[in-house]
């Protein structure tokens, strides 16, 4: 049995939501990925939940009678999601910390969006990408 | 042209985001988008920072003068990034609105946990994947 | 850089009048008004654009208040009539970094000290 699944039921418990009408009016999360096979869609979803995750740990950081249990789960969290990937985890949250009010922050967003744009569809990644696409148009 | 660029420009102007300086100390996505080539990597990426620009324009609704261009910017992102899939699009936004501070989220995220981390890593999604890699395992 | 600085406020009786001043140092577009009652949140009053030809009000000042502004002077009044007690509270003037035109307080990013508006009955 993987660590995180007795510290998540630690967490239940801390937060009384181990009561099936916790489960009333609908999942947050389980419906909503169970919409999407595909990988990088899913992606798309969980990149979203993980930092929902995190951003909630964050606010009960202080309290000690939970922090083994976070701290366990957010290391599982590490391992499956960015591959035990240092990199990648300090990317994402590097994205997650930007403020939204800050004005440089603003600007420079403003300043990257068309870059950022042209780079949103797969077929934009490459050019070779986009060069095997024409060849399979006739 | 695609038609972002053009309402693009215009947002530059209205954020005073067309200097030269406004690239100074480095760049918010730019750089983390050039570490990442592998397509399920970028979207975690990208889902972080899609929802940044989808925050920031919801800040500046209310003001009728960029209206245009920003929802020019986001019909363009819808077809980018989402596909034109309303069901992706919708989903990804339940997601960026659930409040952290709500206790009945929180609770429902908690009760979720679980199976949440089940499903994060790609080779959890389907059993057929797990068993196919035990194979190569010899 | 933008800096704001408010004067005019203090204390006047029920349907009295008072009129604060904003200077403003550096480009403003906008510029706003907002004010913060004891124990309540920091709320709109009023904005006015850089031309001066078009404002917006909170609908409890619509009628009673009007911003102004003077581009010689860099200046932004807002002249307040028809006092209630409702109306004390703290009184800042805020500006945009960027050309936003509207009331929501997240987008203003230079802020006054503030000027004190205490209305008695």
């Known amino acids: 049995q993987d660590p995180y699944v007795k510290e998540a039921e630690n967490l239940k418990k801390y937060f009384n939501a181990g009561h099936s009408d916790v489960a009333d009016n609908g999942t947050l999360f389980l419906g909503i990925l169970k919409n999407w096979k595909e990988e990088s869609d899913r992606k798309i979803m969980q990149s979203q939940i993980v930092s929902f995750y995190f951003k909630l740990f964050k606010n009960f950081k202080d309290d000690q009678s939970i922090q083994k249990s976070v701290e366990t789960i957010k290391e599982d969290m590490n391992v499956k999601f960015f591959n035990s990937n240092k990199k990648k985890r300090d990317d994402f949250e590097k994205l997650t910390n930007y403020s939204v009010t800050d004005l440089n922050v603003q600007r420079k967003a403003i300043h990257e969006l068309i870059q950022v744009m042209a780079e949103l569809s797969p077929a934009a990644k490459t050019g070779k990408r986009k060069r095997s696409q024409m060849l399979f148009r006739g | 042209q695609d038609p972002y660029v053009k309402e693009a420009e215009n947002l530059k102007k209205y954020f005073n985001a067309g200097h030269s300086d406004v690239a100074d100390n480095g760049t918010l996505f730019l750089g983390i988008l050039k570490n990442w080539k592998e397509e399920s990597d970028r979207k975690i990426m990208q889902s972080q920072i899609v929802s940044f620009y989808f925050k920031l324009f919801k800040n500046f609704k209310d003001d009728q003068s960029i209206q245009k261009s920003v929802e020019t910017i986001k019909e363009d992102m819808n077809v980018k990034f989402f596909n034109s899939n309303k069901k992706k699009r919708d989903d990804f936004e339940k997601l960026t609105n659930y409040s952290v501070t709500d206790l009945n989220v929180q609770r429902k995220a908690i009760h979720e946990l679980i199976q949440v981390m089940a499903e994060l890593s790609p080779a959890a999604k389907t059993g057929k994947r797990k068993r196919s890699q035990m194979l190569f395992r010899g | 850089q933008v800096k704001l600085e408010e004067s005019g406020g203090g204390l006047v009786q029920a349907g009295g009048s008072l009129r604060l001043s904003c200077a403003a140092s550096g480009l403003t577009y906008t510029v706003g008004w907002f004010r913060q009652a004891p124990g309540k949140e920091r709320e709109f009053v009023a904005a006015i654009s850089w031309s001066g030809g078009s404002a917006l009000y909170a609908d409890s000042v619509k009628g009673r208040f009007t911003i102004s502004r003077d581009n010689a002077k860099n200046t932004v009044y807002l002249q307040m009539g028809s006092l209630e007690p409702e109306d004390t509270a703290y009184y800042s003037c805020?500006?945009?970094?960027?050309?936003?035109?509207?009331?929501?307080?997240?987008?203003?990013?230079?802020w006054g000290q503030g000027t004190q508006v205490t209305v008695s009955s």
């Open positions: 805020a500006a945009p970094g960027t050309r936003y035109y509207g009331s929501n307080q997240v987008n203003y990013n230079y």
